[in-house]
Interface confidence: low
């Protein structure tokens, strides 16, 4: 099997674990069912539904795979929890009753066309060009609060351009820590901010989002405009929280 | 965790133990001082109410858990598209009533960013207080083990999970068995080290038995959910 067929030279066998970006560093492999790791968040894609019974021991030589959720069954050991366990057990039995001998697949189609975006789980569709355009169109305003993101393992700050319907890195020119704090807040980090720094752009980006410092006191991404140049040739690397680090173990001598 | 090793203090500082009425039920991962990622199937009815849940951080042994950092849960947010039959979109968030104080033993893990490159057999780690063998009891001590990712096309082959794996799931483990997450590990982390940083790639979800040949562990594909996680953090701050 040629694992390496989709990889650029020097990267080796790899796949991009897609969240919701549409850029491919490793081009997608031929589709399988389901198609690898999807480009969109869970609420955006069809959901195949096989029928099976959780928490039933696998019987050898059967074609139905019985699966076990990996939460603890210890809850049912205490006598004071009998009613809770009864409810849990009843749920399991009812689920078990739904087992079909053959796995049944059903595909739900997204309501939205390819030129539209879905408003979270509400099912409303809006044109991609209205996404992050400064006006809320979704019932819960999702189209205006998912306009910044961090990209890749270097935490590159990217902003969505509604005109170009694509994500672009933010140029370091005129950037300051206060904007970093605002971006973190936009993402959902209430009181968290760790670091904001310029790092050399290694993606070979030819387009950027730049700060218009003269714009008034408006939302961060409304201060940003599309530009084909970035004089510092540095992009913003933003970390909202110091995460993913373990303490260095100090050996006693 | 089947086939794992006992964890040392500070090894997995984002790991929390989620208790119901004094009993460990699921694991979870710290992502901010107030937010824990866990599995949606952990908080299904009748356990959907936050009042049932307490989170413990910074302690390795269940028998010593009450000496640890103890936090009541304020909100439980299950993924709106979670399917209890298929375990699709098996992710949930817990907001704590009081923020965690970070130290050497209590720290957050990084949420994965879109565009991260993972090797086809990227080495990942699982951790938890789950059973150390199939149908076993919860472990007193936190265990951890290395498991490689299994590419979705392979995991969906008819010899393994025969198309049960959706894009919202990620498989990890050894196809011959022997190392796996197990009952009681649910909701806990599947992490990988990249660029010197530990990333939350998955949340422990399901599997057919534990550590069986051709039945690797299945995890919620956290990369797919980062957008939803940020949305919830924004909406509930």
């Amino acid at each position: 099997m040629a694992l390496n067929s989709g990889s650029p030279p020097g990267i080796g066998p790899c796949y991009e674990n897609h969240g919701y970006q549409s850029e491919h560093i490793c081009p997608p492999r031929p589709p399988v069912a389901p198609n690898g790791y999807n480009l969109y968040p869970a609420q955006y894609y069809p959901s195949p539904v096989p029928q099976y019974a959780p928490r039933i021991t696998t019987q050898a030589s059967t074609s139905v795979i019985h699966t076990h959720p990996k939460s603890s069954g210890a809850l049912c050991t205490s006598k004071s929890k009998k009613s809770l366990c009864l409810a849990l057990a009843l749920g399991t039995v009812l689920t078990g009753a739904a087992v079909a001998a053959v796995l049944l697949w059903r595909f739900w189609d997204s309501n939205c066309s390819t030129s539209e975006m879905e408003c979270g789980s509400s099912g409303t569709c809006i044109s991609s060009s209205l996404w992050c355009d400064g006006v809320a169109h979704c019932p819960n305003g999702e189209d205006e609060n998912r306009c910044v993101r961090l990209y890749g393992q270097s935490f590159i700050l990217q902003v969505y351009s509604s005109q170009r319907k694509a994500w672009y890195p933010v140029c370091q020119d005129d950037w300051s820590e206060s904007y970093g704090r605002a971006a973190c807040k936009d993402m959902g980090y209430k009181n968290n901010f760790y670091s904001s720094q310029g790092i050399p752009d290694q993606s070979g980006a030819t387009s950027f989002m730049k700060l218009n410092v003269s714009s008034g006191n408006v939302d961060l991404y409304k201060k940003l405009y599309h530009s084909d140049s970035c004089s510092s040739r540095m992009v913003v690397s933003l970390r909202c929280i110091e995460c993913g680090v373990r303490s260095v173990k100090r050996q006693s001598r | 965790i089947v086939g794992g090793l006992n964890a040392s203090p500070g090894d997995w500082p984002w790991q929390v133990s989620l208790h119901v009425q004094g009993v460990h039920v699921c694991g979870g991962s710290i992502i901010t001082p107030e937010w824990i990622v866990t599995a949606a199937h952990c908080v299904e009815e009748p356990l959907s109410s936050p009042r049932y849940w307490t989170a413990f951080a910074g302690i390795l042994r269940q028998s010593l858990m009450f000496y640890g950092s103890r936090h009541q849960v304020e909100k439980v947010i299950s993924h709106p598209n979670y399917d209890s039959k298929t375990k699709n979109n098996d992710i949930a968030l817990m907001k704590l009533q009081t923020p965690l104080a970070f130290n050497d033993l209590v720290k957050p893990v990084c949420l994965p960013n879109p565009g991260m490159m993972l090797d086809l057999d990227q080495e990942c780690w699982i951790s938890g207080w789950g059973a150390t063998y199939e149908k076993g009891k919860t472990s007193d001590v936190l265990n951890a083990a290395m498991v490689p990712l299994i590419e979705p096309s392979k995991c969906n082959s008819k010899y393994i999970y025969n198309n049960l794996i959706t894009p919202a799931m990620i498989c990890a483990g050894f196809l011959q068995g022997s190392v796996d997450s197990c009952q009681g590990d649910s909701g806990g982390p599947l992490v990988t080290l990249k660029n010197g940083i530990w990333w939350l790639i998955g949340d422990t979800s399901w599997g057919s038995g534990c550590a069986k040949a051709l039945r690797p562990g299945v995890y919620g594909n956290v990369t797919v959910f980062t957008d939803w996680i940020y949305q919830q953090m924004r909406a509930n701050s």
Epitope: A60 | G4, E123, M146, V179, A211, A213
Partner: antibody
């Protein structure tokens, strides 16, 4: 070609320890799990344990948990098994064998040449 | 652990005849269309050699006179026609789960 090379014999005293080696060549060392199997004279085969060379987190047959310790050195492509607190019961031929976890079928397609351990005072 | 019972413990067969060795598992070693049973040949002073994998698949380089069959709990190794070089001990082994276990072995002698 694919080979697992083991020393022919090891002599040890009761109560002592012995460390057996198994040097792999001709294939990607980290792509296969290494297993160890015991065979007493005139007896059958007994599985001791396994070690995935890329992680080092070994798995043991319950019977050998306090007897054997498995390790690997990726740089020299060598797997090791240390046997401790030796008794005459440990006198046997010990084989390393590779198991392709990628194919997942779990058969031993290549065996080491075997090391004869003799425990004698 | 899954226990494998081999029979007979030994058998003597004339050149050119058929040798049949049986292996019974204490529980099924078949799942998802595969039977995780394998057969090895061992000659004195040598390591075991893989003959048959997944119940019926001939390992490359092994003569076609060796064949395997069975599923679930009952498996058979056939050698036909038996040749002089086939005098050896034969073991079955399962890999359905850990620990993998071996049968006690069947010693094949030539009459």
């Amino acid at each position: 070609q694919v080979q697992l090379q083991q020393p022919g014999a090891e002599l040890a005293k009761p109560g002592a320890s012995v460390k057996l080696s198994c040097k792999a060549s001709g294939y990607t060392f980290t792509s296969y799990w290494m297993h160890w199997v015991k065979q007493r004279p005139g007896q059958g085969l007994e599985w001791i344990g396994l070690i995935p060379p890329n992680s080092g987190s070994s798995n043991y047959n319950e019977k050998f948990k306090s007897k054997a310790t498995l390790t690997v050195d990726k740089s020299s492509r060598t797997a090791y098994m240390q046997l401790s607190s030796l008794t005459s019961e440990d006198s046997a031929v010990y084989y390393c064998a590779r198991w392709d976890y990628g194919s997942s079928y779990g058969y031993f397609d290549v065996w080491g040449t075997g090391t004869t351990v003799t425990v004698s005072s | 652990d899954i226990v494998l019972t081999q029979s007979p413990a030994s058998l003597a067969v004339s050149l050119g005849q058929r040798a049949t060795i049986s292996c019974r598992a204490s529980e099924s070693v078949s799942t998802s269309g595969y039977s995780y049973m394998h057969w090895y040949q061992q000659k004195p002073g040598q390591p075991p050699k893989l003959l048959i994998y997944l119940a019926s698949n001939l390992e490359s380089g092994v003569p076609v006179r060796f064949s395997g069959s069975g599923s679930g709990t009952d498996f058979t190794l056939n050698i036909h026609p038996v040749e002089e070089e086939d005098a050896a001990t034969y073991y079955c082994q399962h890999s359905r789960e850990l620990p993998p276990t071996f049968g006690a072995g069947t010693k094949l002698e030539l009459k």
